[in-house]
Interface confidence: low
Amino acid sequence: NQDLPVIKCVLINHKNNDSSVGKSSSYPMVSESPEDLGCALRPQSSGTVYEAAAVEVDVSASITLQVLVDAPGNISCLWVFKHSSLNCQPHFDLQNRGVVSMVILKMTETQAGEYLLFIQSEATNYTILFTVSIRNTLLYTLRRPYFRKMENQDALVCISESVPEPIVEWVLCDSQGESCKEESPAVVKKEEKVLHELFGTDIRCCARNELGRECTRLFTIDLNQTPQTTLPQLFLKVGEPLWIRCKAVHVNHGFGLTWELENKALEEGNYFEMSTYSTNRTMIRILFAFVSSVARNDTGYYTCSSSKHPSQSALVTIVEKGFINATNSSEDYEIDQYEEFCFSVRFKAYPQIRCTWTFSRKSFPCEQKGLDNGYSISKFCNHKHQPGEYIFHAENDDAQFTKMFTLNIRRKPQVLAEASASQASCFSDGYPLPSWTWKKCSDKSPNCTEEITEGVWNRKANRKVFGQWVSSSTLNMSEAIKGFLVKCCAYNSLGTSCETILLNSPGPFPFIQDNIS
């Protein structure tokens, strides 16, 4: 139809800095670059209806839906959302195109739905339909990447079945040990799905999307490295692909590599070899063992042998379900006020765990490190010497694990006192939990040496503050002590603290603190 206007629909995402509801506007805010929403004529609809591509918005994001109309003469417009009409003010840009905008600030569920824009120009009437929905992150997944061999090529493909589709990158390192940490200069990252350079020391593939980042390391046996004291172990679940790389370097090409499973050579099609000369003219060979989908009978000792190197093996264990193995009994620690100390949990898990450390309802990031014996360890050192209960929580696709720790800080008691008409109470949070004495100060005992034993009630650890125990002692008022100064003292192996209380009448009491080490 020659009379139809040329229209363009765009989405503008804004950096959030406002907090009102959706409004029709002729003043778009400062924003990121507009995204073309297509706006195609909708088939099988009565009248002229353009439909923009569906718009997905994060909760609390701010956007502008904008229509640019290339039609002669004036235009008038009306927005309709959920059967309500919204004011519409078109304006004209420098190219004399009509511009109509709808600003939605701080997106909420109530602002999701169909936005209809009715435009009337001198030539024709038409409708533009925008569908705005809130991005449903509950449907998002992030799965650990796995490897596949490229057909007819010596290359590996990295695949992560995640939603939204993740960015896949290879993380390569040619050094040993600590220098292969993620941000080390020895680490090279390649944002590619396919990797041809398979001779490196350490090869990992990582996938990242809105949910985070998951990595898989290419399991490697290096025949030129001294074997670990314990046999390396690789866990896989039934149906997952198995990949083991055997690597060896020799002065010349006169050597070969072979894979065996439980002393039987691997079948053809379950391995492939690559070789190259290194810069110093030595020959590097790598031999991959792979099974596209493992079954229980693929469990066993995989041995890589060379005609010029000692053999090395790895134990591959195929499990039906993932697991987390660790002792979950709670552990109590007592340390000095300035002593360096870290909580640590040693565990064996497959697939890799996600974990957190928690203290007083606050979560802390959790780092894990692989040990040579197939175990991993997570340490937490950021306790800032705060006594209390610390929780380590770990989970993977199939298992959950929680372990409790109590941290006690050895210190001299600090005493707080309070009194009422009928009793006086003292509290202390020192550790080890203190013992209490009450003393009466009188003419006969100006140094307060006369011990009170009657009417004293000690409660150990009666109040738990985030796992921190508090001890208290209460003295019931009797005629014998009314009007006298009394002293409560808390003592443990690190010292003594006292507080003096005047037992006269109810009301604010003067307290005199005494610190005796």
Partner: antibody, heavy 120, light 107 residues
Framework: QVQLVQSGAEVKKPGASVKVSCKAS????????MHWVRQAPGQGLEWMGW????????GYAQRFQGRVTMTRDTSTSTVYMELSSLRSEDTAVYYC?????????????WGQGTTVTVSS | DIQMTQSPSSLSASVGDRVTITCQAS??????LNWYQQKPGKAPKLLIY???ILQSGVPSRFSGSGSGTDFTLTISSLQPEDFATYYC?????????FGQGTKLEIK
Amino acid sequence: QVQLVQSGAEVKKPGASVKVSCKASGYTFTNYYMHWVRQAPGQGLEWMGWMNPNSGNTGYAQRFQGRVTMTRDTSTSTVYMELSSLRSEDTAVYYCAKSHYYYFYGMDVWGQGTTVTVSS
Amino acid sequence: DIQMTQSPSSLSASVGDRVTITCQASHDISKYLNWYQQKPGKAPKLLIYAASILQSGVPSRFSGSGSGTDFTLTISSLQPEDFATYYCQQSYSTPYTFGQGTKLEIK
């Protein structure tokens, strides 16, 4: 040879659901992703989602999220695509398509297509 | 979502002609672009994947090139069976999107 055979044409009322099947033969069913693509009359191709027949994992285009479900039966090498809350705009030919061994290298084998008509 | 824009939307040519169809992506898609041919009433057929690799069984008169955002499908010498609609498709990130199609007709 590698083949994908789809179920026959369907006529549905708005609001109803349709379940289209796609039977694979001539290759290892669990080694290749399966995609679903639709084509409205006189229109272009629109990708709906993927399924990994080995794991059962799926990924759907956002515009079909909540309305589409892809399942598989490995014993019969069949994948299914169910679309619910049908509307007239869902009238289209629905194709299943086998992925190249590397899912990002396109769809190398297609079913013959299943025509779904949504009309009151 | 990544938008794919094909041009031209239709094209008239004669047997023996050299024909070029272009496809532009709204974002960098590296080399993850595929080309399909579709004849009326039939399912699409994969011609080229990874921007330039010819699918087995496809005649060598078809070729593809490009990387990043700009891609080209070339038919070096049109044959009668080549008159059809051609679609480009990105497989860089989901949702995988197709171009709107280029209809190649006999002049």
